[in-house]
């Protein structure tokens, strides 16, 4: 089941999935001046079986000036430099597929890809938040959000993160010790069935991950 909305927006913070549940879709978007090739897919889809997950379809962009062709366009040097910058900002593959069954890793960039990625998440997806550079994390609880099914509708849990304007970069998942607070999980979900999966394994995985998993471009 696809989630109705994007994850919640937190002021001065970005979110990132460490792995993508099967069923997740990623739009094939191209940078300005380029378009998806005519025979190409509109999306990539995370699919798989019990032992292996991967992205179906490949995104391909071509120059807008050459409609109806499948020719791949070699980026100019300045475009190659721009893409390299993006890759350096996101140096790690978020998760080894073998460590999290039923999930795909971050797809590698494709040539002339747009600088923003739009994912269509599915129920059970977890994303993690980090304050942007120049802001410091204050935690009241987990800096994460999960797409849940409640009463037949999907919704994202509210991450318990505040980013303050102190000129100090926070480390993921935050150098502040989370406060023991009754509002750490504000939603009361005992009254009906909630569909959740893989939360425990993802949380455990998150604790072992590197800190530099965010880019401001792929929000």
């Amino acid at each position: 089941e696809l989630c109705d909305d994007d994850p919640p927006e937190i002021p001065h913070a970005t979110f990132k999935a460490m792995a993508y549940k099967e069923g997740t879709m990623l739009n094939c978007e191209c940078k300005r001046g380029f378009r998806r090739i005519k025979s190409g897919s509109l999306y990539m889809l995370c699919t798989g079986n019990s032992s292996h997950s991967s992205w179906d379809n490949q995104c391909q962009c071509t120059s807008s000036a050459t409609r109806n062709t499948t020719k791949q366009v070699t980026p100019q040097p300045e475009e190659q430099k721009e893409r390299k910058t993006t890759e350096m900002q996101s140096p790690m593959q978020p998760v080894d597929q073998a460590s999290l069954p039923g999930h795909c890793r971050e797809p590698p960039p494709w040539e002339n890809e747009a600088t923003e990625r739009i994912y269509h998440f599915v129920v059970g997806q977890m994303v993690y938040y980090q304050c942007v550079q120049g802001y410091r994390a204050l935690h009241r609880g987990p800096a994460e959000s999960v797409c849940k099914m409640t009463h037949g509708k999907t919704r994202w849990t509210q991450p318990q993160l505040i980013c303050t304007g102190e000129m100090e970069t926070s480390q993921f998942p935050g150098e502040e010790k989370p406060q023991a607070s009754p509002e750490g999980r504000p939603e009361s979900e005992t009254s009906c069935l909630v569909t959740t999966t893989d939360f425990q394994i993802q949380t455990e995985m998150a604790a072992t991950m590197e800190t530099s998993i965010f880019t401001t471009e792929y929000q």
């Epitope: 109705d4 879709m25 739009n27 978007e29 191209c30 998806r36």
Partner: nanobody, 123 residues
Amino acid sequence: QVQLVESGGGWVQPGDSLRLSCAASGRSFRNYVMGWFRQVPGKEREFLSVITWLGGTLDADSVADRFTISRDNSKNTVYLQMDSLKPEDTAVYYCAADRGPARYISASDVDYWGQGTQVTVSS
């Protein structure tokens, strides 16, 4: 509550152009793909075109050379520019919004529909 309201339909002569609009309200449509279908009496709804938030498009081969979809995110509005209209383009045109592009081609999977706008092409 999500609402999709189409406008711009009407009667035109063969060879003329028409631009349909679909104004969306009731939620954020950032992670939705939006597009157009049409239906003639007694037939199934036919997929025409879809567009993502960032402007990626997918068109049915039958209309790709004559119809162009576009999107104004600031107005939450999607457009369908229809050129060189033919009598066989006569139909009710529906705006649609769906959470995922994979399911979009099948009308049975679409999450939200507009009420439709009639387009008639005849001399």
